[in-house]
Interface confidence: medium
């Protein structure tokens, strides 16, 4: 089964040029780069066009970089977590705690 998660990790000081409503509530500074997106809730693409993208893993949307990635289950790797890794690979990225 494919799990979906939105990552709202913003950089941890206020140098970003824009903020959207799905970032943590914190004091906001900085210009808006000519585009007013502050009150526009951004749709999580993991719930839409990337819903079935990650084969053996979890879709993650990194909002502050507007990037989608797959967090693979143990033993799997690749863009869509579709490739089975050999034993030597299982040590790599085996935990998100690193």
């Amino acid at each position: 089964s494919v799990r979906v998660e939105q990552v709202v990790k913003p950089p941890q000081n206020k140098t970003e040029s824009e903020n959207t409503s799905d970032k943590p509530k914190r004091k906001k500074k900085g210009g808006k780069n000519g585009k007013n997106r502050r009150n526009r809730k951004k749709k999580n693409p993991c719930n839409a066009e990337f819903q079935n993208f990650c084969i053996h893993g979890e879709c993650k949307y990194i909002e502050h970089l507007e990037a989608v990635t797959c967090k693979c289950q143990q033993e799997y790797f690749g863009e869509r977590c579709g490739e089975k890794s050999m034993k030597t690979h299982s040590m790599i990225d085996s935990s998100l705690s690193k």
Epitope: V7, K9, Q12, N13, E16, N33, E66, A67, T69, K98
Partner: antibody, heavy 124, light 112 residues
Framework: EVQLVESGGGLVKPGGSLRLSCAAS????????MSWVRQAPEKGLEWVST????????YYPDSVKGRFTISRDNAKNSLYLQMNSLRAEDTAVYYC?????????????????WGQGTTVTVSS | DVVMTQSPLSLPVTLGDPASISCRSS???????????LHWYQQRPGQSPKLLIY???NRFDGVPDRFSGSGSGTDFTLKISRVEAEDVGVYYC?????????FGQGTKLEIK
């Protein structure tokens, strides 16, 4: 082959402007955040700017904020850095770099592909 | 800003010997949600930097297993188990937990 090629560097007087370009090939450019990093002569690396995949979010250190503007054209697979009000201390090799996390099983925000760099010299 | 301090700044090593580079950050690099965004880059003479280790201990594609990274919080280490001639260059630690992203001053590894 995944490749980044910078251009646009040169000699400019203090207070002048320059626009750097970075042509990307061999990967889906629109899926990756991109960054500029510079290296002054005989010095270390200094991060200059990052832009999100769609260009919505841009980030700068205080040293260039208000003077430099990062932008991208995903249709042209190109990254840009507009540099205004240039100072002698902006003299450096400017590298274009692809930023993770895509294609990893443990995303990391690191810079995994770098161009060869373009040299900017600010001098009167 | 997060200050990254590397030591030593110069590291003369005999071929085949181990080498170790320390990197200390002025504040914790632990991101509460997802991990620790501390990376190591290698810059060989006359070349662009290359990603070596990402997120503390993960070797990037094609990086030999003689390179390893460790550490947590504010203290991190890059180790080379047996230095080879091609390892000569400058090594930088870098953090991308906090904006602005910052790099260490660099450690120049040279062969004795």
């Amino acid at each position: 082959e995944v490749q980044l090629v910078e251009s646009g560097g040169g000699l400019v007087k203090p207070g002048g402007s320059l626009r750097l370009s970075c042509a990307a090939s061999g990967f889906t450019f629109s899926s990756y955040p991109m960054s500029w990093v510079r290296q002054a002569p005989e010095k270390g690396l200094e991060w200059v700017s990052t832009i999100s995949t769609g260009g919505t979010y841009t980030y700068y250190p205080d040293s260039v904020k208000g003077r430099f503007t990062i932008s991208r054209d995903n249709a042209k697979n190109s990254l840009y850095l507009q540099m205004n009000s240039l100072r002698a201390e902006d003299t450096a090799v400017y590298y274009c770099a692809r930023q993770g996390p895509i294609l990893r099983k443990n995303y990391y925000y690191g810079m995994d592909v770098w161009g060869q760099g373009t040299t900017v010299t600010v001098s009167s | 800003d997060v200050v990254m301090t590397q030591s030593p700044l110069s590291l003369p090593v005999t071929l085949g010997d181990p080498a170790s580079i320390s990197c200390r950050s002025s504040q914790s690099l632990v991101d509460g949600q997802d991990g620790t965004y501390l990376h190591w880059y290698q810059q060989r003479p006359g070349q662009s930097p290359k990603l070596l280790i990402y997120k503390v201990s993960n070797r990037f594609d094609g990086v030999p297993d003689r390179f390893s990274g460790s550490g947590s919080g504010t203290d991190f280490t890059l180790k080379i188990s047996r230095v080879e001639a091609e390892d000569v260059g400058v090594y930088y630690c870098s953090q991308s937990t906090h904006v602005p992203y910052t790099f260490g001053q660099g450690t120049k590894l040279e062969i004795k």
